[in-house]
């Protein structure tokens, strides 16, 4: 069984305020089954940005078609970026259970927000 890896290829992404940010995440295996979630920050204060199993998340869309049964691309686009969105974003695989439990995290992508060009 191939061990699941979570690949966040970009260490950092810089976006102008008002633009959209694309945060890339791919997984190398579908197993164990369970949802992908995105968070800003780490630890107890982290903020849920996207959860594959529930929604909607009005400013967040998935870049690829996640309803494909073999999909392994969980990149997201966040629209209308503001300075409050700055931080490190983690793509995390959960393993199914009651409740689902965190299985593996990507290394994180730091989002910085530039001033809106005048």
């Amino acid at each position: 069984e191939e061990e699941l890896q979570i690949i966040q290829p970009d260490k950092s992404v810089s976006v102008a305020a008002g633009e959209s940010a694309i945060l890339h995440c791919t997984i190398t295996s579908l197993f164990p089954v369970g949802p992908i979630q995105w968070f800003r920050g780490a630890g107890p204060a982290r903020v849920l940005i996207y959860n594959q199993r529930q929604g909607p998340f009005p400013r967040v869309t998935t870049v690829s078609e996640t309803t494909k049964r073999e999909n392994m691309d969980f990149s997201i686009s966040i629209s209308n970026i503001t300075p409050a969105d700055a931080g490190t974003y983690y793509c995390i695989k959960f393993r199914k259970g009651s409740p689902d439990t965190e299985f593996k995290s990507g290394a994180g992508t730091e989002l910085s927000v530039r001033a809106k060009p005048s």
Epitope: L30, F31, V33, P35, E65, T66, T67, K68, R69, K96
Partner: antibody
């Protein structure tokens, strides 16, 4: 309220074709994968085919692969099942079902009866 | 193939458990579907192993561990008489499979 309404069933002869439709309402159809499930007289439920939300990927049980084609038209909120080379074994009630994020089912239509008889 | 008992029976108020075996916990999610008469529309009572739709009474619950899933009806009622089908989605094959169904009789 989520509603799924199948149509297109009827009586056909062996070897003939039939196209089933499923009209969806009450949810954002283009965001959900969909499936067809059938039930032969006196038998249990049998999953036949599923299709991703955008329609680019389809999946089939072996027994209908090559004879049945699942498709969708998101502009019309409609799901289809094209059935060719029908045999008596295809006699059943055919249901369309909305898929959950992990390809189980949450909502079902009332079904349409297909009878294959000479 | 998913295996479930052909029939179970219970008195009103009792707890009923219906098991479904044959899946792989590592790669399979389970759902449970109620059909009150042949040819009538199935109703989803549990999906994603243990998630109950908002319009389903709280007496229905689901769980999964190892290679089996369980549907539990706590305080069964006469109106729960039906055939219950388990289904699995296997992420290895991309295929959905149904069990043969369990007929619940409430005495």
């Amino acid at each position: 309220d989520v509603q799924l309404v199948e149509s297109g069933g009827g009586v056909v002869r062996p070897g003939e074709s039939l196209r089933l439709s499923c009209a969806a309402s009450g949810f954002t159809f283009s965001s959900y994968a969909m499936s067809w499930v059938r039930q032969a007289p006196g038998k249990g439920l049998e999953w036949l085919a599923g299709i991703s939300a955008g329609g680019s990927d389809a999946y089939y049980i072996d027994s209908v692969k090559g004879r049945f084609t699942i498709s969708r038209d998101n502009s019309k909120n409609s799901l289809y099942l094209q059935m060719n080379s029908l045999t008596a074994e295809d006699t059943a009630v055919y249901y369309c079902a909305r898929e959950t994020w992990n390809h189980l089912f949450d909502y079902w239509g009332l079904g349409t009866l297909v009878t294959v008889s000479s | 193939a998913l295996t479930q008992p052909a029939s179970v029976s219970a008195n009103p108020g009792e707890t009923v458990k219906i098991t479904c075996s044959g899946g792989d916990w590592y790669s399979t999610y389970y759902g449970w579907y109620q059909q009150k008469s042949p040819g009538s529309a199935p109703v989803t009572v549990i999906h994603s192993d243990d998630k109950r739709p908002s319009d389903i009474p709280s007496r229905f619950s689901g769980s999964a561990s190892g290679s089996a899933a369980t549907l539990t009806i706590t305080g069964v009622r006469v109106e729960d008489e039906a055939v219950y089908y388990c289904a699995g989605y296997d992420g290895r094959t991309y295929i959905n499979t149904f069990g043969a169904g369990t007929t619940l009789t409430v005495l």
